[in-house]
Interface confidence: low
Amino acid sequence: GCLTQLYENAFFRGGDVASMYTPNAQYCQMRCTFHPRCLLFSFLPASSINDMEKRFGCFLKDSVTGTLPKVHRTGAVSGHSLKQCGHQISACHRDIYKGVDMRGVNFNVSKVSSVEECQKRCTSNIRCQFFSYATQTFHKAEYRNNCLLKYSPGGTPTAIKVLSNVESGFSLKPCALSEIGCHMNIFQHLAFSDVDVARVLTPDAFVCRTICTYHPNCLFFTFYTNVWKIESQRNVCLLKTSESGTPSSSTPQENTISGYSLLTCKRTLPEPCHSKIYPGVDFGGEELNVTFVKGVNVCQETCTKMIRCQFFTYSLLPEDCKEEKCKCFLRLSMDGSPTRIAYGTQGSSGYSLRLCNTGDNSVCTTKTSTRIVGGTNSSWGEWPWQVSLQVKLTAQRHLCGGSLIGHQWVLTAAHCFDGLPLQDVWRIYSGILNLSDITKDTPFSQIKEIIIHQNYKVSEGNHDIALIKLQAPLNYTEFQKPICLPSKGDTSTIYTNCWVTGWGFSKEKGEIQNILQKVNIPLVTNEECQKRYQDYKITQRMVCAGYKEGGKDACKGDSGGPLVCKHNGMWRLVGITSWGEGCARREQPGVYTKVAEYMDWILEKTQSSDGKAQMQSPA
C-alpha cells in the first residue's frame, strides 16, 4: 500500500539498486517512485556525513519483503517509494535550493535577474534538466546573475556542493509548465536517427512514448513493430536524443513508428503508467508470483496491489484455468519492461497501474474522511490477516473483526459470540478490503468450532478471547495470510509502532465502515490505564493503547480485531480489540486482550492430533 512516512536518523541497510545525488529527501523519494525496482530510499544530507563524496547521496533500494533493516545514522532520512500513492505521484519538483550548486554539463549560460527567471529558462529549453543561478551577492562579480542550464546522463546532478549565494533547482517540464509545446504526432513507417539513450521492449508505440516522456534524456523515439523484418528487433523501443533536441534525419522504413517525448506538453502530461490490456500477448520477465483470479482486470488489479509487480500475463490456456479462474502471472524486470513479448498466445498482458495518478480509491487511500475513529483507509494486502466476522440471519451484517493465525484458525474476542454462539449463522470473510465488495457469490469460511476461553464471563472484561476453527483450511495469498503470534509472556519487548484495524464505527454513534480502516496508536502502561479506569480492574492479561488527548481509537465493530505491532521488521499480534469507555475519548484508552498471556491456551487449543501447532509463531 501507500506508505508516506519518513524515518529521521535512519538509514536502510542493503538492497541498493541505484544511487545518485539529490538536493533533498523529497526529490530522492520522487526518483525512487519512478525507478522500476525502487521500494525504499535513504538520503544523506550534507549535515549528516563528513565524507564529501556521500553528501547529498540518494540511495535507491529494493526488497523482496518490502522492507529493509534500518540502522541509526544521525541526520539521515529514509522512506518509501510513493508507488501506489495515486495523486501523490508526480515528477514535478518546484523547490529552489539556496546555498547549493547542482553540478552537471553546463550547456547554456545567460544573465537573468532572478532565480525564477532562470528556472523558467530551464523549463523552456528542451535539453535542460536542472540549473544553478549565482545571485547578486555571489563572491565573484563576473558570475553574478549567471543562469547555468544543465543536464546529466541520469537527469540528476553529477555532484552537489554547498556554495554560498548560489541557488539551484529543476526544470518544471514535468509540471506541464513548458512553453515549448509538444508534438503529439505518431509517424508510421518512419525511423529517426541520432543517439540511442536506452532500449526497452514495449507492446506498442504508445507505451514507448510514455517511457520516453519519463526518461530523463529521451527527446524522441523509434518503435519497431511486431512484424519488423528482423525478429530480434521486434517490439524494440529505442529512446533517442540529439544535440539540437530534434531528429537530425529520418528514414522511411516499413513497420517502424516514431514520435516525440511529451514532456514538453503544456497543461497535461500522459500518466506515468500504461493501462491498456493486450489480448493474445504474453509478457516475459522474472516470476514474482502466480495466482488464480477471475478475469484479466482482476489480474491487473492484483499486479497493481503487489507493489513489486511491474507487468503481468493472464493465461487462458485450459490447463491454466480452474472453473472461472485462470492463472495470473505477476512479473518484473530490471528496467520495468518485459524481457520478451510473444504474440498469438492465449494470454492477455498488461502493466501494473501502481504509478497511475488516478484510479481506484483502493489503490490510493487518501480520499475518504469517515473512518475507524481517527483512522485512514487501508490498502490491499496491508493487513492480510484481518477477517470480517459476519452474521447471516435474515440480513447479513458485519459484527466483529478477527485475525487469521493459521490455515484453519482465527483469533477473536469472546464477547463477539455473546448471544450468538450458533456456529452456522456466522460467515468469515478473509482477503477483503471493502465490505461492499461482498456479494452473494463471494466465498466465505464457515465455522467448525467456536472455542471461548473457559474463564470468560459475559459482560465482564476478563479473558475476552476466543478461537474459531474453520470448516476448511484457507490457502495463503498476498491478501490472506496469518499474523505471527508473540512469544509466551512477552513483556520485555517495547513496541513503538502499533496499529489497530477494523471496519468499525467512525464515531461512538456511527456506522460500520466500507473500507478497512487503520489507526496508529501508542501503547499505554497498565498503571496509566488503571488510573483512567478506576471502576475496572486492568489486569496483566490486558494491554491498553490510546492517545492522552483521544481522537484515535477502535470502536464498535472493531471488536475481536487485531492490535498489531511491528518489531524488527515483523508484525506480531499483541492485542485483541476488547473494550473501552466510549470511543476515542480523552484519557480513556482502548483495552485489548494481551495475546502473549494466552499463548499456552492458544497452543493447547490449536494443537493438532500429530502434536504440531497449527498457527504462526515467530520462533
Epitope: 484479466v296 493472464y314 481506484d360
Partner: antibody, heavy 120, light 107 residues
C-alpha cells in the same frame, strides 16, 4: 466465424413454458461464460441470466428467479434457457451472449435474438 | 443492485460533430463498465470494455473514459451510421445492469 444462433422463441400463453436454445460456433464454447439478455419491445436491455463455463454456477435477475433455468451442454456447444410460468412482462427479444474474462465480463459476441411473446 | 443512469436519454447532433454520453453508477464499479451500440432490428454490439479499451474492429473515433462511478463515451467526427442507440453496462457485480440507453439522432 464466431457465431451464436438462438432458436425456440414464439407465442405462448401466460403460465406456459418455452425452451430457448443458442448454438455456438467458431470458438471453444466450453471455455466461455454465457448469458441471456432480453429487450422488451421499444425498451432497453435487461440482463436475465448467466452461467460459468463448467455450468457449475448460475445467476439470475430477480425478475426471473425461480421461473427460468439456464443450462449448457458443452458437448453440443449449446446454451439453453428453460422458461416456466411465463408472464406478459416476459415478452421480449431474447439474446444469447458470450462473456469473456479478457473483456472484464463484457458481452463481446451476441446472437441475432429470438422473439418470445406471452399473450392470451 | 447497482443502478446505471445514462444521460442524456436522447441527443441531437450533426455529421462531423463530437458528442459525449455519460453513465453514472450508483456505487463504485472500478473500471468494469462497457459500452454497446444497437442499430434498429439488430443485436447490440460491444464498442468499449473495461471503461476505455476499444473492442477489436471498432473505429478509433469511439473512446471511453472514467473509473469508480462516472464514465463517458465520446464519439469524435460523427458518421451517418453512428446515429443509433448506445447503452452502458456494468459487469462489476451481478445482476449485471444496463443504462436506459441514449438515442443519438440527426439534427
Amino acid at each position: 466465424e464466431v457465431q451464436l444462433l438462438e432458436s425456440g422463441g414464439g407465442l405462448v400463453q401466460p403460465g406456459g413454458s418455452l425452451r430457448l436454445s443458442c448454438a455456438a460456433s467458431g470458438f471453444t464454447f466450453s471455455w466461455y461464460y454465457m448469458g441471456w439478455v432480453r429487450q422488451a419491445p421499444g425498451k432497453g436491455l435487461e440482463w436475465v441470466s448467466w452461467i460459468v463455463s463448467s455450468g457449475g454456477l448460475t445467476l439470475y435477475a430477480d425478475s426471473v428467479k425461480g421461473r427460468f433455468t439456464i443450462s449448457r451442454d458443452n458437448s453440443k456447444n449449446t446454451l439453453y434457457l428453460q422458461m416456466n410460468s411465463l408472464r406478459a412482462e416476459d415478452t421480449a427479444m431474447y439474446y444469447c451472449a458470450r462473456t469473456t474474462v479478457t473483456t472484464g465480463d463484457a458481452f463481446d459476441i451476441w446472437g441475432q435474438g429470438t422473439m418470445v411473446t406471452v399473450s392470451s | 443492485d447497482i443502478q446505471m443512469t445514462q444521460s442524456p436519454s436522447s441527443l441531437s447532433a450533426s455529421v462531423g460533430d463530437r458528442v459525449t454520453i455519460t453513465c453514472r453508477a450508483s456505487q463504485s464499479i472500478s473500471r468494469y463498465l462497457n459500452w454497446y451500440q444497437q442499430k434498429p432490428g439488430k443485436a447490440p454490439k460491444l464498442l468499449i470494455y473495461a471503461a476505455s479499451t476499444l473492442e477489436t474492429g471498432v473505429p478509433s473515433r469511439f473512446s471511453g473514459s472514467g473509473s469508480g462511478t462516472d464514465f463517458t463515451l465520446t464519439i469524435t467526427t460523427l458518421q451517418p451510421e453512428d446515429f443509433v442507440i448506445y447503452y452502458c453496462q456494468q459487469s462489476y457485480s451481478t445482476p449485471y445492469t444496463f443504462g436506459q440507453g441514449t438515442k443519438l439522432e440527426i439534427k
